[in-house]
Amino acid sequence: PRSIDVKYIGVKSAYVSYDVQKRTIYLNITNTLNITNNNYYSVEVENITAQVQFAKTVIGKARLNNITHIGPLDMKQIDYTVPTVIAEEMSYMYDFCTLISIKVHNIVLMMQVTVTTTYFGHSEQISQERYQYVDCGRNTTYQLGQSEYLNVLQPQQ
């Protein structure tokens, strides 16, 4: 068997809402993956499990099941959404994300994704990790790859 390649492309969109009284941030983050099947037979994408971390704390998880099949030598682009919550111990971020005196409220999140594929009863898992910028201050749609984290410090805690 040849390889199945999983490439995390980046954040497609981030939709934000707030709970004023509980100083909580809700971020629905949609990510894009490219999955390439280099084999001469079809493979099933059985599930995608994803989680998002902020400051080493898991703030959101998602799992998609029975997603699609990918034909021989074919590639599919898959979007998946992870609902995240920044609250409680991290509610100090509420002030940063809702501060009107600054335009962009970028926070650095670690995106982790694991894709499980199957073919002929055989199962294979491929994982990816990537740091990404997300604006927690407004709804944002990104050009793919635009939200990539380069080498910046997180907002001070």
Epitope: Y18, D19, K22, Y26
Partner: antibody, heavy 121, light 112 residues
């Protein structure tokens, strides 16, 4: 119906500790934060803090930071408040109150029966 | 901390008449989302407090529509029309916007 049943009156000596309970019934305990409020005899209301029964996370009014410890037991749907190093100023009625509602629209919709704490030597 | 002030410690009223109870906050409780986070509670003698009004002007479940709330960002009014004997007790305003949540000192409604 939704009810918050609080433990009975407590008589304690200065320097001692007491643990008050607030048993919830008629709703899903872990879905709502539980707050505690103090009322000294003939006086107004003072917010002490809250516990999120789902996560155990607590937030206290700074004034009660070293006085009140808030906890919750999911299995018995009960919230607790421990008051330590009691002084005469801690003599009061203590209420638990459920914070009902929804996002950005929360309010204390159900109050407990109240527990009277008397500190006397 | 936000200070909630109820200037009148008590208000006398004749049954059947209307009465207004006022409260002020040291900081605006009007949020940019359009909501004003002021609340009113009634504590009847020997009882626990009960919610009357939430977000300045919304009537809580089971509360008679004789009660109404109004105001601005820092000044709030609870109005009771056609006062009944069962309305006696202490009325508290509260801010539910910033920690620590704070209450007014209370206004006692007394029947003449």
């Amino acid at each position: 119906q939704v009810q918050l049943q609080q433990s009975g009156a407590e008589l304690a000596k200065p320097g001692a500790s007491v643990k008050l309970s607030c048993k919830a019934s008629g709703y899903t305990f872990i879905s709502y934060w539980m707050h505690w409020v103090k009322q000294r005899p003939g006086q107004g209301l003072e917010w002490i803090g809250y516990v999120n029964p789902s996560s155990g996370y607590t937030k206290n009014n700074q004034k009660f930071k070293d006085k009140a410890t808030l906890t919750a037991d999911k299995s018995s749907s009960t919230a607790y408040m421990q008051l330590s190093s009691l002084t005469y100023e801690d003599s009061a009625v203590y209420y638990c109150a459920r914070e009902g509602g929804s996002i950005s629209d929360w309010y204390f919709d159900v109050w407990g029966t109240g527990t009277t704490v008397t500190v006397s030597s | 901390d936000i200070v909630m002030t109820q200037a009148a410690p008590s208000v006398p009223v004749t049954p059947g008449e209307s009465v207004s109870i006022s409260c002020r906050s040291s900081k605006s409780l009007l949020h940019s989302n359009g909501n004003t986070y002021s609340y009113w509670f009634l504590q009847r003698p020997g009882q626990s407090p009960q919610l009357l009004i939430y977000r300045m002007s919304n009537l809580a479940s089971g509360v008679p529509d004789r009660f109404s709330g109004s105001g601005s960002g820092t000044a709030f009014t609870l109005r009771i029309s056609r006062v009944e004997a069962e309305d006696v007790g202490v009325y508290y305003c509260m801010q539910h916007l910033e920690y620590p949540y704070t209450f007014g000192g209370g206004t006692k409604l007394e029947i003449k």
